[in-house]
């Protein structure tokens, strides 16, 4: 299933960097979230659970990330114009069943004011 | 697994239209192929098999398409400059397991010579 464009603010700019917000439903217990730039995997985070609700986080492609009960935020730093592209949050839901894949995304526009090191 | 940029000629122009080629490995028996323009779904085709290897094709978002044993071609007609964008082939593999999603894509450049109705 593809949701298409994110229906929330996916890009949050601060200090020459960007926080890319990848949301998931809060009933989801075990999942994989990948951040794609165009068709390339930038970041890959998997959350699994065991008995006693012990959580395990696996990052195949590590990015600075932040996990909440309904979102994963990935942080990109030192923005320059080459960061402008389509970014997709690729969510694979394992638990609860059935298995499901959703892809949401948007275009990251880079404006002069958001660059990390503007020429004065 | 995400392949990123297509390592084959994804766009084939003819008669003011374009054929967008979405390849998949020929061992894949059951799959969903979606054509995305940016983050939007343009086309959606699912191939499943039943008993006696009976094939079923389902299109949630219908486009003129052509299926072979290792590719799906989607056809866009009456090209104009608004068609210029990133296009992605989003392949979900159901069989053989495990579940797998690949996203390949590229930028469709529209040049004067490819437009369907050039002003003379």
């Amino acid at each position: 299933e593809i949701n298409g464009s994110a229906n929330y603010e996916m890009f949050i700019f601060h200090n020459g960097g960007v926080q890319i917000l990848c949301k998931y439903p809060d009933i989801v217990q075990q999942f994989k979230m990948q951040l794609l730039k165009g068709g390339q995997i930038l970041c890959d985070l998997t959350k699994t659970k065991g008995s006693g609700n012990k959580v395990s986080i696996k990052s195949l492609k590590f990015c600075h990330s932040q996990l909440s009960n309904n979102s994963v935020s990935f942080f990109l730093y030192n923005l320059d114009r080459s960061h402008a592209n389509y970014y997709f949050c690729n969510l694979s839901i394992f638990d609860p069943p059935p298995f499901k894949v959703t892809l949401t995304g948007g275009y990251l526009h880079i404006y002069e004011s958001q660059l990390c090191c503007q020429l004065k | 697994e995400i392949n990123g940029s297509a390592n084959y000629e994804m766009f084939i122009f003819h008669n003011g239209g374009v054929q967008i080629l979405c390849k998949y490995p020929d061992i894949v028996q059951q799959f969903k192929m979606q054509l995305l323009k940016g983050g939007q779904i343009l086309c959606d085709l699912t191939k499943t098999k039943g008993s006696g290897n009976k094939v079923s094709i389902k299109s949630l978002k219908f486009c003129h398409s052509q299926l072979s044993n290792n590719s799906v071609s989607f056809f866009l007609y009456n090209l104009d400059r608004s068609h210029a964008n990133y296009y992605f082939c989003n392949l979900s593999i159901f069989d053989p397991p495990p579940f797998k999603v690949t996203l390949t894509g590229g930028y469709l450049h529209i040049y004067e010579s490819q437009l369907c109705c050039q002003l003379k």
Partner: antibody, heavy 124, light 107 residues
Framework: EVQLVESGGGVVRPGGSLRLSCAAS????????MSWVRQVPGKGLEWVSG????????DYADSVKGRFTISRDNAKNSLYLQMNSLRAEDTALYYC?????????????????WGQGTLVTVSS | EIVLTQSPGTLSLSPGERATLSCRAS???????LAWYQQKPGQAPRLLIY???SRATGIPDRFSGSGSGTDFTLTIRRLEPEDFAVYYC????????FGPGTKVDIK
């Protein structure tokens, strides 16, 4: 092609020990949670133990808790079951099985690929 | 722990007939964490259905699963010769637990 091959079964006296192994090939082993399931010949299936992708989450059936230990070596694509203080009721065919999704979890997931099993007989 | 009961114990049918197998849980199985497996003599179990109603990859569409809460059903629309086997239901919403099985044999 995915293959799971169990080994290490055999005949052992009550109170004895055995170590079962499951060698995996044709898959990215650390993408998968793994479980051991046993079956008394001619009877039903019983889940024994599960382990997540890196071994930091494990769980056991009440009938084997404190006696069996599950572990894995991802570098060797191998899953293990150390069985101590064996009892006659542990006699069974032991299968290893992987999680269906490639989620890395053994928890709340069904099992797709199974090995052919290794027979453990506990008898005096 | 959740106990699963399967009925009937044995189902005698002919090829081409419809098979309906039942699995009842002693308490509600959360979010349909229920699977069905097929096992033939001398072989390992094979996953057919997960999440109560989703067919696993490569499983023919004559197999279907339904139900929720405590009552679940596996239906084989038209029995093929290769479908005669033992069928187990399994709940996997907590420590996994299997039912005792239903044997489908040729009448």
């Amino acid at each position: 092609e995915v293959q799971l091959v169990e080994s290490g079964g055999g005949v052992v006296r009550p109170g004895g020990s055995l170590r079962l192994s499951c060698a995996a090939s044709g898959l990215t082993f650390d993408d998968y949670g793994m479980s051991w399931v046993r079956q008394v010949p001619g009877k039903g299936l019983e889940w024994v133990s599960g382990i997540n992708w890196n071994g930091d989450n494990t769980d056991y059936a009440d009938s084997v808790k404190g006696r069996f230990t599950i572990s894995r070596d991802n570098a060797k694509n191998s899953l293990y079951l150390q069985m101590n203080s064996l009892r006659a009721e542990d006699t069974a065919l032991y299968y290893c099985a992987r999680d269906y999704y490639g989620s890395g979890s053994y928890y709340n997931v069904p099992f797709d690929y199974w090995g052919q099993g290794t027979l453990v007989t506990v008898s005096s | 722990e959740i106990v699963l009961t399967q009925s009937p114990g044995t189902l005698s049918l002919s090829p081409g007939e419809r098979a309906t197998l039942s699995c009842r849980a002693s308490q509600s199985v959360s979010s349909s964490y229920l699977a069905w497996y097929q096992q033939k003599p001398g072989q390992a179990p094979r996953l057919l259905i997960y999440g109560a109603s989703s067919r696993a990859t490569g499983i023919p569409d004559r197999f279907s699963g339904s139900g929720s809460g405590t009552d679940f059903t596996l239906t084989i629309r038209r029995l093929e010769p290769e479908d005669f086997a033992v069928y187990y239901c399994q709940q996997y919403g907590s420590s996994p637990f299997f039912g005792p099985g239903t044997k489908v044999d040729i009448k």
